[in-house]
């Protein structure tokens, strides 16, 4: 998606099938207010962006309302009347689901079921990562619905958990983004804890799968 034209790099993120963010990095035009023009239908006239993102006082992106649109975004980034980047992109290929909400934990002996609110669209994976201070890496389990049971836990150990949502690659393609992680929650003997002793700070989530 970041193909360059006249030195312009673009990034598209479709937040939760609600808002499309298109940002650009144009070293040649770093002190210029480039304008963003778009349409959702190949036959319509272009509209100009009304919600620009600014960086160091200059336009660097545009936010568009695009609630659950199964559309191609046609857009043109211009310097005055001169187009410096023109493209069309199928928006859903750059989907970033929202972070899981209402995450709950239900313990039964050596197993925990993690649930959260399913998003309003499908073909997603809900991933739970967990670790104890004795684990060198995060363990992971994922399901198509936000109802993930992890078995074989040690009731005496403290475990840290966090959850995220990913778009299925076979359905949405390879260019989507995972959601941000939910907050880390720590549990021991079926009870919530402030922290798990000796647990290293969780790594920042990567934007790759």
């Amino acid at each position: 998606q970041g193909g360059a034209a006249e030195g312009v790099q673009i990034q598209i993120i479709y937040f939760n099938l609600e808002t499309v963010q298109v940002t650009w990095n144009a070293s040649k035009y770093s002190r210029t207010n480039l304008t963003f023009h778009y349409r959702f239908n190949g036959d319509e006239a272009y509209d100009q962006c009304t919600n620009y993102l600014l960086q160091e006082g200059h336009t660097s992106g545009c936010l568009l309302d695009a609630e659950q649109r199964d559309d191609i975004l046609y857009f043109s980034i211009r310097n005055g009347t001169h187009p410096v980047f023109t493209a069309s992109r199928w928006m859903v290929y750059y989907l970033k689901p929202s972070s899981p909400k209402h995450v709950r934990f239900s313990w039964h002996q050596d197993a925990v079921t993690v649930t959260c609110s399913d998003l309003s669209y499908g073909d997603l994976l809900y991933e739970v990562q967990y670790r104890s201070p004795f684990d060198t890496e995060w363990q992971s389990k994922q399901e198509n619905t936000c109802n993930v049971t992890i078995e074989g836990l040690d009731a005496e150990k403290c475990y840290s958990f966090w959850v995220r949502v990913k778009a299925m690659e076979d359905v949405y393609g390879p260019d989507t983004y995972p959601s941000d992680w939910s907050e880390v929650t720590c549990w021991q003997r079926g009870e919530i804890r402030d922290a798990c002793a000796e647990t290293p700070t969780p790594p920042k989530p990567k934007l790759s799968k």
């Epitope: 399901e143 198509n144 359905v171 949405y172």
Partner: antibody, heavy 119, light 107 residues
Framework: QVQLVESGGGVVQPGRSLRLSCAAS????????IHWVRQAPGKGLEWVAI????????NCDQKFKDRFTISRDNSKNTLYLQMNSLRAEDTAVYYC????????????WGQGTLVTVSS | DIQMTQSPSSLSASVGDRVTITCKAS??????IAWYQQKPGKAPKLLIY???YRYSGVPSRFSGSGSGTDFTLTISSLQPEDFATYYC?????????FGQGTKVEIK
């Protein structure tokens, strides 16, 4: 609007070959997975193969792998199904279908082309 | 291969009836299930994807549910145009497989 038009069907003798075509229009051909699905007369649907036109990756049901080959020509926005060593049980309507988004469920279907294998 | 078993294979119903069709997968397919409607001589039409999400333009009387191995397509109030054959299909793993179909006929 999205359109898929199959062609190339007809009557063919057992053991012979046939190449089906699926001409796509109304969308960016290289953005989607496209499939062949067949349906024998009075029977149910049977998935045959998939191709991702962007990279040419294919997957074919094992039972057709030795005889059927799925391919595409991006410059012509056309998908093909090469069928060799045809048998009477290959008699069916052959549909090409496009996924809803990049992959997944099949949202757009052609009208189908009938292949009859008979001596 | 994952087997998809639909039941019943056919049913008779009247306009206004609530109709339920079930589909059972031979192994866990998560929610990677689609439902299609097909009328004689026509290509199938997508109704439901990801087990429970209605495809755009599909009337709200059609709904899907289930995950794992057991799935249901429900038509809440059968309309004259709903008499057709319905297929479930899994897209969890290749080869993709369809159920054998359920024919909904007029009583």
């Amino acid at each position: 609007q999205v359109q898929l038009v199959e062609s190339g069907g007809g009557v063919v003798q057992p053991g012979r070959s046939l190449r089906l075509s699926c001409a796509a229009s109304g969308f960016t051909f290289t953005d989607y997975a496209i499939h062949w699905v067949r349906q024998a007369p009075g029977k149910g649907l049977e998935w045959v193969a998939i191709i991702r036109p962007s990279n040419g990756n294919t997957n074919c049901d094992q039972k057709f792998k030795d005889r059927f080959t799925i391919s595409r020509d991006n410059s012509k926005n056309t998908l093909y199904l090469q069928m060799n060593s045809l048998r009477a049980e290959d008699t069916a309507v052959y549909y090409c279908a496009r996924s809803r988004v990049w992959g997944g469920s099949l949202a757009y279907w052609g009208q189908g082309t009938l292949v009859t294998v008979s001596s | 291969d994952i087997q998809m078993t639909q039941s019943p294979s056919s049913l008779s119903a009247s306009v206004g009836d609530r109709v339920t069709i079930t589909c059972k997968a031979s192994q866990n397919v998560g929610t990677n299930i689609a439902w299609y409607q097909q009328k004689p001589g026509k290509a199938p039409k997508l109704l439901i994807y990801s087990a429970s999400y209605r495809y755009s333009g599909v009337p709200s009387r059609f709904s899907g549910s289930g995950s794992g191995t057991d799935f249901t397509l429900t038509i809440s109030s059968l309309q004259p145009e709903d008499f057709a054959t319905y297929y479930c299909q899994q897209y969890k793993s290749y080869p993709w497989t369809f159920g054998q179909g359920t024919k909904v006929e007029i009583k």
